[in-house]
């Protein structure tokens, strides 16, 4: 069984306020089964940005078609970026259970927000 890896290729992404940010995440295996979630920040204060299991998340769309049964691309686009969105974003695989438990995390992508061009 191939060990699941979570690849967040971009260490950092810089976006102008008002634009959309694309945060890339791919996984290398579908197993163990369970949802992908995105968080801003780490630890108990982290903020849920996207959960494959539930929605909607009005400002967040998936870049690829996650309803494909073999999909391994969980990149997201966050629209209308503001300075409050700055931070490090983690793509995390959960293993199914009651409740689902965190299985593996990507290394994180730091989002910085530039001032809107005048």
């Amino acid at each position: 069984e191939e060990e699941l890896q979570i690849i967040q290729p971009d260490k950092s992404v810089s976006v102008a306020a008002g634009e959309s940010a694309i945060l890339h995440c791919t996984i290398t295996s579908l197993f163990p089964v369970g949802p992908i979630q995105w968080f801003r920040g780490a630890g108990p204060a982290r903020v849920l940005i996207y959960n494959q299991r539930q929605g909607p998340f009005p400002r967040v769309t998936t870049v690829s078609e996650t309803t494909k049964r073999e999909n391994m691309d969980f990149s997201i686009s966050i629209s209308n970026i503001t300075p409050a969105d700055a931070g490090t974003y983690y793509c995390i695989k959960f293993r199914k259970g009651s409740p689902d438990t965190e299985f593996k995390s990507g290394a994180g992508t730091e989002l910085s927000v530039r001032a809107k061009p005048s």
């Epitope: 163990p32 089964v33 078609e65 009651s98």
Partner: antibody, heavy 118, light 107 residues
Framework: DLQLVESGGGVVRPGESLRLSCAAS????????MSWVRQAPGKGLEWLAG????????YYIDSVKGRFTISRDNSKNSLYLQMNSLTAEDTAVYYC???????????WGLGTLVTVSS | ALTQPASVSANPGETVKIICSGG??????YGWYQQKSPGSAPVTVI????KRPSDIPSRFSGSASGSAATLTITGVRVEDEAVYFC???????????FGAGTTLTVL
């Protein structure tokens, strides 16, 4: 109110074709994968085919591969099943079902009866 | 293939458990589907192993462990008489399968 309404069933002769339709309402059809499931008289449920939300990816059980084609028209909120070279073994009630994020089913149509008889 | 008992019976108010075996916990999610009469529309009572749709009474619950899933009806009622099909999605094959169904009789 979420609704799935199948149509297109009827009586056909062996070797003939039939196209089933499923009209969806009450949810954002283009965001969900969909499937067709059938139930032969006195038998259990049998999954036949699934299609991703955008329609680019399709999946079939081996016994209908090459004879049945699942498709969708998101602009019409409609799901289809084209059935060719029908045999008596295809006699069943055919249901369309909405898929959950992990390809189980949360809502079902009322079904449409297909009878293949000479 | 998914295996489940052909029939179970219970008195009103009792707890019923229906076990479905044959999947791989590592790659499989389970669901449970209620059909009150042959050819009528199935109703999803559990999906994703243990998730109950909002319109399903709380007496229905689901769990999964190892190679089996369990549907539990706590305080069964006469109106719960039906055939219950377990279903599974296997992420290895991209295929959905169903058990043969369990007829629940409430005495």
């Amino acid at each position: 109110d979420l609704q799935l309404v199948e149509s297109g069933g009827g009586v056909v002769r062996p070797g003939e074709s039939l196209r089933l339709s499923c009209a969806a309402s009450g949810f954002t059809f283009s965001s969900y994968a969909m499937s067709w499931v059938r139930q032969a008289p006195g038998k259990g449920l049998e999954w036949l085919a699934g299609i991703s939300a955008g329609g680019s990816d399709t999946y079939y059980i081996d016994s209908v591969k090459g004879r049945f084609t699942i498709s969708r028209d998101n602009s019409k909120n409609s799901l289809y099943l084209q059935m060719n070279s029908l045999t008596a073994e295809d006699t069943a009630v055919y249901y369309c079902a909405r898929e959950t994020w992990n390809h189980l089913f949360d809502y079902w149509g009322l079904g449409t009866l297909v009878t293949v008889s000479s | 293939a998914l295996t489940q008992p052909a029939s179970v019976s219970a008195n009103p108010g009792e707890t019923v458990k229906i076990i479905c075996s044959g999947g791989d916990y590592y790659s499989t999610y389970y669901g449970w589907y209620q059909q009150k009469s042959p050819g009528s529309a199935p109703v999803t009572v559990i999906h994703s192993d243990d998730k109950r749709p909002s319109d399903i009474p709380s007496r229905f619950s689901g769990s999964a462990s190892g190679s089996a899933a369990t549907l539990t009806i706590t305080g069964v009622r006469v109106e719960d008489e039906a055939v219950y099909f377990c279903g599974a999605y296997d992420g290895r094959t991209y295929i959905n399968t169903f058990g043969a169904g369990t007829t629940l009789t409430v005495l």
